[in-house]
């Protein structure tokens, strides 16, 4: 058993049929010695008396808010949550496996630049009685500070018969050094509580591996005289790290016909313009990637050829 | 050229060669992003290779103030990786494929380090400790980890030379 926060405790249980469970001793936080009784949740049934209460925690029915009273007065509370371990593996019932980039990916994180700011998100089908708490650091043995905000519900989607909820959190490294080469990964830890079930999820990454620039901005076409060619120009996204002479991007320019089956013409360039042939009903798209480190491409920015 | 004492390197040549190094490092291990090395408990390897750190003066401001600190740091790292790529981790069994870019990568590391320190000029003699002997089954993972770290190292070096070529060239 360990303390998650004041008056909230997590009991770690090996979860299998007829498991013995864990013996837990609760102590009433009071100077009083006599006349103390214990109840669980809203029930008025007295579970025991005295300053301490010893319970055998085996299942969710044994978890909940234990309260000690004297007379009609509440003295203190202890909320017990359960953390299940099945076949040596901690349960992951609360969050959905996103399966990208690999199985058992519950947390996904992205950064728009090298400033040390990043966003993580996760999915669940649970809509109520759900709380999250997020902590982060750079390195684990001698951790350096990363500050995370509160997790918020950022999207709701319908997937077949189910509703899916996306939560996200923004974090910022306290003393980020955008130009340095990271040697210690960022660690992100999410505590999830659904009713009386506790679970924790972790992710470990270098900012450089989760970079995904915003799409190029101000995408414009300029027809070239007496030609089917156009000059496409664009600018670095506002959110990308500066100076651009140091934090450089490379770009992919694509000409795509109306039909998905039509051949795509692609040009790669380090410049912020390119000359391409504009076919009727086609569109021109541009996306960006770090020039020197192959992290994710941005989403496409597009304009129609006409 | 980055001669100890302070004259400038051939920024544009360094930019071109460092960008080539980035390409080679990724082509030597293109699928690197799909394997989570931290699951392999690779702290020792990542701790054992060079890193361009915050105080090394490789940020735009540091380069403007005095690029020599950063260039020396990059030079040290290039020599270090060149020695690793020339060791039995890469030359031993299992043999690399004949068209593997590792050979080119090795030569380019040497080429860039020589651009930074031409004959007759010396920062300090580069020493690296004796390498632990490795067995074929260990080498595949070590190669993977070294290339993964090298990709991050040369990315920073390439940014430095690109910025230098754009803003510090005579």
């Amino acid at each position: 058993i360990w303390e998650l926060k004041k008056d909230v405790y997590v009991v770690e249980l090996d979860w299998y049929p007829d498991a013995p469970g864990e013996m837990v001793v609760l102590t009433c936080d009071t100077p009083e010695e006599d006349g103390i009784t214990w109840t669980l949740d809203q029930s008025s049934e007295v579970l025991g008396s005295g300053k301490t209460l010893t319970i055998q925690v085996k299942e969710f029915g044994d978890a909940g808010q234990y309260t000690c009273h004297k007379g009609g007065e509440v003295l203190s509370h202890s909320l017990l949550l359960l953390h299940k371990k099945e076949d040596g593996i901690w349960s992951t019932d609360i969050l959905k496996d996103q399966k990208e980039p690999k199985n058992k990916t519950f947390l996904r994180c992205e950064a728009k630049n090298y400033s040390g700011r990043f966003t993580c998100w996760w999915l669940t089908t649970i809509s109520t009685d759900l709380t999250f708490s997020v902590k982060s650091s750079r390195g684990s043995s001698d951790p350096q500070g990363v500050t995370c905000g509160a997790a918020t519900l950022s999207a709701e989607r319908v997937r077949g018969d189910n509703k899916e909820y996306e939560y996200s959190v923004e974090c910022q490294e306290d003393s980020a050094c955008p130009a340095a080469e990271e040697s210690l990964p960022i660690e992100v830890m999410v505590d999830a509580v659904h009713k009386l079930k506790y679970e924790n999820y972790t992710s470990s990454f270098f900012i450089r591996d989760i970079i995904k620039p915003d799409p190029p901005k101000n995408l414009q076409l300029k027809p070239l005289k007496n030609s089917r060619q156009v000059e496409v120009s664009w600018e670095y996204p506002d959110t990308w790290s500066t100076p651009h002479s140091y934090f450089s991007l490379t770009f992919c320019v694509q000409v795509q016909g109306k039909s998905k089956r039509e051949k795509k013409d692609r040009v790669f360039t380090d410049k912020t313009s390119a000359t391409v042939i504009c076919r009727k009903n086609a569109s021109i798209s541009v996306r960006a990637q770090d020039r020197y480190y192959s992290s994710s491409w941005s989403e496409w920015a597009s304009v129609p050829c006409s | 050229r980055a001669v100890p004492g302070g004259s400038s390197p051939a920024w544009t040549q360094c930019q071109q060669l460092s960008q080539k190094l980035c390409t080679l490092a990724w082509s030597a291990h293109p699928l690197v992003g799909h394997m989570d090395l931290r699951e392999e408990g690779d702290e020792e390897t990542t701790n054992d290779v060079p890193h361009i750190q915050c105080g090394d003066g490789c940020d735009p401001q540091g380069l403007r103030d005095n690029s020599q600190f950063c260039l020396q740091r990059i030079h040290q790292g290039l020599i270090f990786y060149e020695k690793l790529l020339g060791s039995d981790i890469f030359t031993g069994e299992p043999s690399l494929l004949p068209d593997s870019p590792v050979g080119q990568l090795h030569a380019s590391l040497l080429g860039l380090s020589q651009l930074l320190q031409p004959e007759g000029h010396h920062w300090e003699t580069q020493q690296i400790p004796s390498l632990s002997p490795s067995q074929p089954w260990q080498r595949l993972l070590l190669r993977f980890k070294i290339l993964r770290s090298l990709q991050a190292f040369v990315a920073v070096a390439a940014r430095v030379f690109a910025h230098g070529a754009a803003t510090l060239s005579p």
Partner: antibody, heavy 120, light 113 residues
């Protein structure tokens, strides 16, 4: 917890072969190299040799012609053999481990040592 | 072989006073690529096996009191004890693991005055 324990005869006759065993527990021998070090009575420490995680060995050049280090992974045991011993080989013999990495590490855990006396 | 020269060989100290031991290898133990010095410090208490105090010249092993500190780089290293306690008596050794064969200093015997 991590343990290394040396064992073997405490007395060996001159010109014979000294044989010691180091039994380890609490760590994976595929992640650690195991070294032998000795200390003559009242003197300093001398590195004898190492067996690497991959099974290859390196020895101190001053002892190389007489030393063999091997291991039995199924038993989590390492052995040291030192042939043609003389009184100068009388020492406390230690085994110690270092974490496998690109470069050899420092010894973080040692056995308690076993005294071997060479005498007729 | 890298020769490790330790001084002094004997060090009598009054409890509560500081102590300092020097170790000078015959060649540099600094790998400038990764900025590590391949040097460790050990304490061998009477009748015991050596125990690790400091690795990579300046990193304290977990569980080692913070009165022990290591410093130096290249060919000049120092182990300092800020305030010697009775339990610190024993022989202190430096070890280089930069090149084969590993070599130790001759040892410094710290005793209480």
């Amino acid at each position: 917890q991590v343990q290394l324990q040396e064992s073997g005869p405490g007395l060996v006759k001159p010109s014979e072969t000294l044989s010691l065993t180091c039994t380890v527990s609490g760590f994976s021998i595929s992640s650690y190299n195991v070294h032998w070090i000795r200390q003559p009575p009242g003197k300093g420490l001398e590195w004898i040799g190492v067996i690497w995680t991959g099974g290859s060995t390196d020895y101190n050049p001053s002892l190389k012609s007489r030393v063999t280090i091997s291991r039995d992974t199924s038993k989590n045991q390492f052995s040291l053999k030192l042939s043609s011993v003389t009184a100068a080989d009388t020492a406390v013999y230690y085994c110690a481990r270092d974490k496998y990495g690109l470069f050899p590490g420092y010894f973080d855990y040692w056995g308690q040592g076993t005294l071997v006396t060479v005498s007729s | 072989d890298i020769v490790m020269t330790q001084t002094p060989l004997s060090l009598p100290v009054t409890p509560g006073e500081p102590a300092s031991i020097s170790c000078k290898p015959s060649q540099s133990l600094l790998s400038s690529g990764n900025r590590k010095n391949y040097l460790a410090w050990y304490l061998q208490k009477p009748g015991q096996s050596p125990q690790l105090l400091i690795y990579y010249a300046s990193t304290r092993q977990s569980g080692v009191p913070d009165r022990f500190s290591g410093s130096g780089s290249g060919t000049d290293f120092t182990l300092k004890i800020s305030r010697v306690e009775a339990e610190d008596v024993g022989v202190y050794y430096c070890l280089q693991h930069f090149n084969y064969p590993w070599t130790f200093g001759q040892g410094t015997k710290l005793e209480i005055k």
